[in-house]
């Protein structure tokens, strides 16, 4: 014969757990069915009667089987610095993420509590390191023989063109202008920026995932852009 | 709950050295730590941070000399490859939990770290 | 970013009087800066966070106020036990100290 199947609310075996989408209820001592992603344990059960679920209300969600008396709160509306990546449904929270030209300045756990913009590296100084999701752009002051003459967080330090005959020297914000009609540069035209963001690992506070990272995402908005920084502007 | 370093010793520069953060009273899964370091007579120095996904932040000037992990009931500092500027009284600290800001609340004794030829 | 500073470096005040810090972050962090005080030998006692909030058990005598980049933490009626060094603290992924203010209690 085959064996029963039991329907919740049920007493289980002594030793044996509860099956897949029930849970063990230590008031009724019994096993109960689970309520499904979007909905909330609106009656606990009792020895009788299975758990009563009820949806969840607007702006709020449960995103796994659940006995939770009330659903969760979604986060707040994503502000003017983020992009909404995911909406507030009954089954998901609202995931924001900050946009282009910013990054995830406080994340502690899945989500993103502030954005910040990437800073911009300032004439005479290109960027060292890339942004990224979460880390901000490295400067650096461009080296003897390089250049570096935009407001950019993206821009790197370019060699001077050399000349036959040199009209102006280069310095560290400015190329060498030449007399002669035909300067030769010592590097490829196209490389000039660094795409952006670029993953790397020795990126300043760049997380190190174990096992993956968590998506960025952001609830609470920054005061203001960021101020001037050595070798940077937050303009 | 308490939070207490072990490992700090004399060693002579380019010897790995690793740190201990031992806790006791604390589910590691529910807060994140942190590492930090004073110099004799100087200030604060955050090393790094490690949330309880895994993921792990370091300050820039640490990215790569130094590595954080982390057991069921400790939270260990590696120092890779210390030199003289690493001498430094170390210091473990449990973060107040959340998700809001990072702020620590509870911080062991520390542990002295000497690195000299 | 990360780059605290804070100010002044020392301060004398008398018993029972107030003693006002400062602190300037170099890029906008809202309200996520904390205030620990330090005694010689001890690790840091975290007093403030949220830029206002009091930690547990930490008298209402401290207070601190500020958002964005300037942030101030007020130490009212001072005793004897409040001399101490004062750092504070950016509680954004990039954590950074201010360099400590010293409070003599004369």
């Known amino acids: 014969l085959p064996a029963q199947v039991a329907f919740t609310p049920y007493a289980p075996e002594p030793g044996s757990t509860c099956r897949l989408r029930e849970y063990y209820d230590q008031t009724a001592q019994m096993c109960c069915s689970k309520c499904s992603p979007g909905q909330h344990a609106k009656v606990f059960c009792t020895k009788t009667s299975d758990t009563v679920c009820d949806s969840c209300e607007d702006s709020t969600y449960t995103q796994l089987w659940n006995w939770v008396p009330e659903c969760l709160s979604c986060g707040s509306r994503c502000s003017s610095d983020q992009v909404e990546t995911q909406a507030c449904t009954r089954e998901q929270n609202r995931i924001c993420t900050c946009r282009p030209g910013w990054y995830c300045a406080l994340s502690k756990q899945e989500g993103c509590r502030l954005c910040a913009p990437l800073r911009k590296c300032r004439p005479g100084f290109g960027v060292a390191r890339p942004g990224t999701e979460t880390s901000d752009v490295v400067c650096k002051p461009c080296a003897p023989g390089t250049f570096s003459n935009t407001t950019s967080s993206t821009d790197i330090c370019r060699p001077h063109q050399i000349c036959n005959v040199v009209a102006i020297p280069g310095n560290a914000s400015m190329d060498a202008v030449c007399t002669s009609t035909s300067p030769t540069r010592s590097m490829a035209p196209g490389a000039v920026h660094l795409p952006q963001p670029v993953s790397t690992r020795s990126q300043h506070t760049q997380p190190t995932p174990e096992p993956s990272t968590a998506p960025s995402t952001s609830f609470l908005l920054p005061m203001g852009p960021s101020p001037p920084a050595e070798g940077s502007t937050g303009d | 709950q308490s939070v207490e370093e072990s490992g700090g010793r004399l060693v002579t520069p380019g010897t790995p050295l690793i740190l201990t953060c031992t806790v006791s009273?604390?589910?590691?899964?529910?807060?994140?730590m942190g590492w930090f370091r004073q110099a004799p007579g100087e200030g604060l120095e955050w090393i790094g941070s490690r949330r309880t996904d895994g993921i792990t932040y370091y300050a820039n000037w640490a990215e790569g000399r130094f590595t954080i992990s982390r057991t069921s009931t400790t939270v260990d500092l590696e120092i890779t490859s210390p030199t003289t500027e690493d001498t430094a009284t170390y210091f473990c600290?449990?973060?107040?939990?959340?998700?809001?800001?990072?702020?620590?609340?509870?911080w062991g004794p520390g542990t002295l770290v000497t690195v000299s030829s | 970013a990360g780059d605290m500073t804070q100010t002044p470096a020392s301060v004398e005040v008398a018993v029972g009087g107030t003693v006002t810090i400062k602190c300037q972050a170099s890029q906008s962090i809202n309200i996520y800066l904390a205030w620990y005080q330090q005694k010689p030998g001890q690790p840091p006692k975290l007093l403030i966070y949220d830029a206002s909030k009091l930690a547990s058990g930490v008298p209402s005598r401290f207070s601190g106020s500020g958002s964005g980049t300037e942030f101030t933490l007020t130490i009212s009626d001072l005793e004897c036990a409040d001399a101490a060094t004062y750092y504070c603290?950016?509680?954004?992924?990039?954590?950074?100290f201010g360099g400590g203010t010293e409070v003599v209690v004369k």
């Open positions: 600290g449990r973060d107040v939990g959340g998700d809001g800001g990072w702020y620590f609340n509870l």
């Open positions: 009273g604390i589910d590691l899964s529910n807060y994140a």
């Open positions: 603290q950016q509680g954004i992924n990039n954590i950074g």
